[in-house]
Amino acid sequence: PEPPTACREKQYLINSQCCSLCQPGQKLVSDCTEFTETECLPCGESEFLDTWNRETHCHQHKYCDPNLGLRVQQKGTSETDTICTCEEGWHCTSEACESCVLHRSCSPGFGVKQIATGVSDTICEPCPVGFFSNVSSAFEKCHPWTSCETKDLVVQQAGTNKTDVVCGPQDRLRA
């Protein structure tokens, strides 16, 4: 019969014959022969292959280096890589999460719109009229100005985006 020029899914062409690819978690040790199937063997500890493959070497699991602020979020298996994330208060510098940086704080006049996660930085927003933030923080939102009226007081000093209003007693008309 004519040697094949293309093979089925999960097969590869070598020496004019179709051999089965190795399943995820296993590496290629020897191609198939006319007598035997492809010889595949499991990846070792701390190694993985995540696709049907003909790789002769497994990939090393990613190392989550604590010196770079990294920790293991999900331990790798023979079929999956280790997933790293950052220590509390830090976030990844890239999608691959190869290193971490400290979460950004929102300066006075700005509040936290979205708290940082292990993979995203703090998102700040300017405090709109009626709100303020007087601290540099990675957690604090803009706070609403104090309502003097509800306390039966009057505004003595207007608020800004960085300061609250100052309330004081209402002036009493003297007889």
Epitope: N15, L28, S30, H57
Partner: antibody, heavy 117, light 111 residues
Framework: EVQLEESGGGLVQPGGSLRLSCAAS????????MCWVRQAPGKGLEWVAC?????????YYASWAKGRFTISKDTSKTTLYLQMNSLRAEDTAVYFC?????????WGQGTLVTVSS | DIVMTQSPSSLSASVGDRVTITCQAS??????LSWYQQKPGQAPKLLIY???TLASGVPSRFSGSGSGTDFTLTISSLQPEDFATYYC?????????????FGQGTKVVIK
């Protein structure tokens, strides 16, 4: 045709050295692990050493072969080698090369090594 | 190294007999067990791999079973061309080393 052919055997004195070769043909040498297995006259099969598939040189040896025997390959020549040093009378055997690591699907016909004074 | 203990070392049988050869590994080798047939002056021939997978072209009268440390080769009805020596071979791998081991062989002779 897919085949393996050993050469380099012969008579050697105790303490001497010998390098065996195994020429592979008809298959992709780079994607196949290769091993050496020996058989003393009238005795059983004995695993000697293996070399992994691929470009990085990962080798495995029977505990008795470590230090005296070295397996290597030249992918461009599709040839497997076994360097044998400090040979002893008990190393007298037919040496086979075989394709595979956890199983041996293809064997050469073997080359006879005789260690004698 | 992995040590494979094969028994019996020889057996006499007649054509048509059912023959069983056993092999024991010194430690668990999962299913990485192969069987070979060797005739005088020839290289071994792979019969069975991964405990029970028949190599292409091997007659179905040959079968293998077992797992872990204990394995069996069975020839259901011995044929004249089956008189030969049979070897088991185990493969063991850990994070630190790889080892192959052969059994001592079983010579099947005509009764």
């Amino acid at each position: 045709e897919v085949q393996l052919e050993e050469s380099g055997g012969g008579l050697v004195q105790p303490g001497g050295s010998l390098r065996l070769s195994c020429a592979a043909s008809g298959f992709d040498f780079s994607t196949n692990a290769m091993c050496w297995v020996r058989q003393a006259p009238g005795k059983g099969l004995e695993w000697v050493a293996c070399i992994a598939a691929g470009s990085s040189i990962i080798t495995y040896y029977a505990s008795w072969a470590k230090g005296r025997f070295t397996i290597s390959k030249d992918t461009s020549k599709t040839t497997l080698y076994l360097q044998m040093n400090s040979l002893r009378a008990e190393d007298t055997a037919v040496y086979f090369c075989a394709r595979g690591l956890s199983r041996f699907a293809l064997w050469g016909q073997g080359t006879l090594v005789t260690v004698s004074s | 190294d992995i040590v494979m203990t094969q028994s019996p070392s020889s057996l006499s049988a007649s054509v048509g007999d059912r023959v069983t050869i056993t092999c024991q590994a010194s430690q668990s080798i999962s299913s990485y067990l192969s069987w070979y047939q060797q005739k005088p002056g020839q290289a071994p021939k792979l019969l069975i791999y991964l405990t029970s997978t028949l190599a292409s072209g091997v007659p179905s009268r040959f079968s293998g079973s077992g797992s872990g440390t204990d394995f069996t080769l069975t020839i259901s009805s011995l044929q004249p061309e089956d008189f030969a020596t049979y070897y088991c071979q185990g493969y063991y791998s850990s994070s630190s080393y790889v080892s192959n081991g052969f059994g001592q062989g079983t010579k099947v002779v005509i009764k």
